[in-house]
């Protein structure tokens, strides 16, 4: 699987992983460059409460991962909240999912050795018009 | 922002831990779960009451090279009649992810972890109304 900047050998026939064009393992600066001012999603916005498709945030903690805490969204209702504050089942609350990269300690418990891991998180919910299947 | 050391006392540093120079860490960029796929409901970006578009950002010095960013199409939300209702707001939902940046330091190449804020989609919210005294 070849991506920008780093090429990952897939089999023994691939070029030597020590070749500068094919690093499988890299040494990375411990300081993470952070261009964002984002923190805990509960603090940064209250969209999860004000949304017409509100959600609850569940804390997912894993000390073997960086970041160790990830907040997972779960839609509160199947339907959406209408102008009267009631659940309208003609509409659907659906999760918005995103693949993110995290660091997994590898070997386990090692303080400064990691592997990239792709995980799927539900970030929030949105209100959609349902797909109606007409039965012939 | 430094990556915290393992905090739990029962996590003794195993003998098998690789030696790492000070101020850096060893990172294997062979991704765990590389082939997992998002199984979101079909084209929710168009069916949402707060619809959004996608823009692919491409950076040859970043891993992964492509990061998809969403942008809300409207300020308001789409009502049952398909019209924009500006009494409600379309707002972006964001999530941080890690990327690896390949950089040049003099004649050598180095790698830096970077946090990138990804706009994943949009949701429709009731606006916060500020009453002026």
């Amino acid at each position: 699987i070849v991506k920008a900047g780093i090429t990952i050998p897939r089999n023994p026939g691939c070029p030597n992983s020590e070749d500068k064009n094919f690093p499988r393992t890299v040494m990375v600066n411990l300081n993470i460059h952070n261009r964002n001012t984002n923190t805990n999603p509960k603090r940064s916005s209250d969209y999860y409460n004000r949304s017409t498709s509100p959600w609850n945030l569940h804390r997912n903690e894993d000390p073997e991962r960086y970041p160790s805490v990830i907040w997972e969204a779960k839609c509160r209702h199947l339907g959406c909240i209408n102008a009267d504050g009631n659940v309208d089942y003609h509409m659907n609350s659906v999760p918005i999912q995103q693949e993110i990269l995290v660091l997994r300690r590898e070997p386990p418990h090692c303080p400064n050795s990691f592997r990239l891991e792709k995980i799927l998180v539900s970030v929030g919910c949105t209100c959609v018009t349902p797909i109606v299947h007409h039965v012939a | 922002r430094k990556i915290p050391k393992v905090g739990h006392t029962f996590f003794q540093k195993p003998e098998s831990c690789p030696p790492v120079p000070g101020g850096s860490m060893k990172l294997d960029i062979g991704i765990i779960n590389e082939n997992q796929r998002v199984s979101m409901s079909r084209n929710i970006e168009s069916r949402s009451t707060s619809p959004w578009n996608y823009t692919v950002t491409w950076d040859p010095n970043r891993y992964p090279s492509e990061v998809v960013q969403a942008q809300c199409r409207n300020l308001g939300c789409i009502n049952a009649q398909g019209k924009e209702d500006i009494s409600m707001n379309s707002v972006p939902i964001q999530q941080e992810t890690l990327v690896v940046r390949r950089k040049h330091q003099g004649c050598s190449v180095s790698f830096q972890l970077e946090k990138v804020l990804v706009t994943v989609g949009c949701t429709c919210v009731t606006p916060v109304i500020h009453h002026v005294q």
Epitope: - | P60, R62, H104, K115, L117
Partner: antibody, heavy 117, light 106 residues
Framework: EVQLVESGGGLVQPGRSLRLSCAAS????????MHWVRQAPGKGLEWVSG????????GYADSVKGRFTISRDNAKNSLYLQMNSLRAEDTALYYC??????????WGQGTTVTVSS | EIVLTQSPGTLSLSPGERATLSCRAS???????LAWYQQKPGQAPRLLIY???SRATGIPDRFSGSGSGTDFTLTISRLEPEDFAVYYC???????FGQGTKVEIK
């Protein structure tokens, strides 16, 4: 001295192909991503395509996707742009540019491509 | 599609004056970087500023970049005769260029 020299431009009929080359010198070519940027007569700059240091990743502008292919030969310190199904709107001065992670820091003098019947 | 809008289209100033060029992005993305280039007639573009505010090698300190989010500015503190040219902003990552601002002698 860091230098980029483009070649391969010329007059070509619509629908035909052309291959541009860029010879790099004065820097470690295989350490850097490279790009093609064009400028139509009297107009602004338009990014065309880019390629990572090891050819592992390539990017294209929507206007050329499926028609143009970027490639590089690190052993020859060369960058290429294969342009197929050329259109009149592809007429421009094509620049080769070196990537310095946050911007394009070295540019060639350009090669002119004219698409006309 | 991301659009970078530069203003004004043309700036008529005298040598020694201060020039302020604006670049507004239709969208702001984390992990995108803004750069400024100078182009003189018949010449290739030249990098002035990268990552919003960092001066490229060999660029005089009268050139400075600032801004964040969607609004960015290139400032030339005291115009020299050689500074009269067209200036482009560019968003690295989305690969969009602004339409350019021409700085001409008044």
């Amino acid at each position: 001295e860091v230098q980029l020299v483009e070649s391969g431009g010329g007059l070509v009929q619509p629908g035909r192909s052309l291959r541009l080359s860029c010879a790099a010198s004065g820097f470690t070519f295989d350490d850097y991503a490279m790009h093609w940027v064009r400028q139509a007569p009297g107009k602004g700059l338009e990014w065309v395509s880019g390629i990572s240091w090891n050819s592992g990743s390539r990017g294209y502008a929507d206007s050329v996707k499926g028609r143009f292919t970027i490639s590089r030969d690190n052993a020859k310190n060369s960058l290429y742009l294969q342009m197929n199904s050329l259109r009149a709107e592809d007429t421009a001065l094509y620049y080769c540019a070196k990537d310095m992670v946050y911007a394009l820091d070295v540019w060639g003098q350009g090669t002119t491509v004219t698409v006309s019947s | 599609e991301i659009v970078l809008t530069q203003s004004p289209g043309t700036l008529s100033l005298s040598p020694g004056e201060r020039a302020t060029l604006s670049c507004r992005a239709s969208q702001s993305f984390s992990g995108s970087y803004l750069a400024w280039y100078q182009q003189k007639p018949g010449q290739a573009p030249r990098l002035l500023i990268y990552d919003t505010s960092s001066r490229a090698t060999g660029i005089p300190d009268r050139f400075s970049g600032s801004g964040s989010g969607t609004d960015f500015t290139l400032t030339i503190s005291r115009l020299e005769p050689e500074d009269f040219a067209v200036y482009y902003c560019q968003q690295y990552g989305t690969w969009t260029f602004g339409q350019g601002t021409k700085v001409e002698i008044k």
